[in-house]
């Protein structure tokens, strides 16, 4: 069985101010166990943008049925964007592991670039 | 407070249908995904169904193609519809609601099923 | 048939350290949880994910895991423990949800 890839199909987005910016992530395998999570930036300052497991991110929604047991989409949109919420943004497999769990596989990133709205 | 209040057991005969209803509260409904649980008298638990928020269902292998799990996220409400029924299906039926990772983190307190003639 | 396996009945001390052990599925494939059931009542969720305590659950109640095999441990049992235990477990590679056959707790 090969290796779980995440899938992070585009380099970059742009999306007007306002509108609402869609994060497009697949993973390969639905193993093994564990949670997928968005994060804009890399290293230890990243910030947190979904969490599949648990929070609340009342501007984020995803695009498939993640209550699904064969869901591999972990696609997501982000509502009422603006100039602030450019970068990059990283699509993050983990694996269960305790007492926490253990960063697995990383997409390749999405730039999201904001366009200002025309005045 | 999460509440699930499973209705519609009783006595039915071999070869009959009955339908169990979970009446949920005290969370979002459309959100979660939930199961049917069963435990026949002084056994252990059996999972019998799974569905999703979106509707996908998912059976164990003693009831496929007999048992229909569905929903009504209007109504917050599940649904079991049971057919061609055997004395293998007496039991205790429970409702539970799915953590993100499909294990139970609450239960209704059951509606017992007898099949019997 | 039970896919998950764990002893029929363990039996401890009141104060003593009760260990329940549950085997049967892969690690990278599953995800288990430990349910309480006293008689007459539903189960009760008291570890999820291997070793995740929900609110409300005593803090002597521990899960723990070693390749196929999770344990959950009671410290310092007490009367109000006695009860049948529970291994359920979510198989990514069914997608089912087998249990074990479970485990009576007596407290002596």
């Known amino acids: 069985e090969e290796e779980l890839q995440v899938i992070q199909p585009d380099k970059s987005v742009l999306v007007a101010a306002g509108e609402t910016a869609t994060l497009r992530c697949t993973a390969t395998s639905l193993i093994p166990v564990g949670p997928i999570q968005w994060f804009r930036g890399a290293g230890p300052g990243r910030e947190l943008i979904y969490n599949q497991k648990e929070g609340h991110f009342p501007r984020v929604t995803t695009v498939s049925d993640l209550t699904k047991r064969n869901n591999m989409d972990f696609s997501i949109r982000i509502g009422n964007i603006t100039p602030a919420d450019a970068g990059t943004y990283y699509c993050v497999k983990f694996r269960k592991g305790s007492p926490d769990d253990v960063e697995f596989k990383s997409g390749a990133g999405t730039e999201l670039s904001v366009r200002a709205k025309p005045s | 407070e999460v509440q699930l209040v499973e209705s519609g057991g009783g006595v039915v005969q071999p070869g009959g249908s009955l339908r169990l209803s979970c009446a949920a509260s005290?969370?979002?409904?459309?959100?979660?995904?939930m199961s049917w649980v069963r435990q026949a008298p002084g056994k252990g638990l059996e999972w019998v169904a799974g569905i999703s928020s979106g509707s996908d269902t998912y059976y164990g292998d003693s009831v496929k193609g007999r048992f229909t799990i569905s929903r009504d996220n209007s109504k917050n409400t599940l649904y079991l519809q049971m057919n061609s029924l055997t004395a293998e299906d007496t039991a205790v039926y429970y409702c539970?609601?799915?953590?993100?990772?499909?294990?139970?983190?609450?239960w209704g307190q059951g509606t017992l099923v007898t099949v019997s003639s | 048939s039970y896919e998950l396996t764990q002893p029929p009945s363990v039996s401890v001390s009141p104060g003593q350290t009760a260990r329940i052990t549950c085997s049967g599925g892969a690690y990278s494939s599953y995800y288990y949880a430990w349910y309480q059931q006293k008689p007459g009542q539903a189960p009760v969720l008291v570890i999820y994910s291997d070793d995740k305590r929900p609110s409300g659950i005593p803090e002597r109640f521990s899960g723990s895991s070693s390749g196929t095999t999770v344990t959950l441990t009671i410290s310092g049992v007490q009367a109000e423990d006695e009860a049948d235990y529970y291994c359920?477990?979510?198989?990514?590679?069914?997608?089912?949800?087998?249990f074990g056959g479970g485990t009576k707790l007596t407290v002596l």
């Open positions: 359920g477990g979510y198989d990514q590679s069914s997608y089912t949800n087998p």
């Open positions: 005290g969370f979002t409904f459309s959100s979660n995904a």
């Open positions: 539970a609601r799915e953590t993100w990772n499909h294990l139970f983190d609450y």
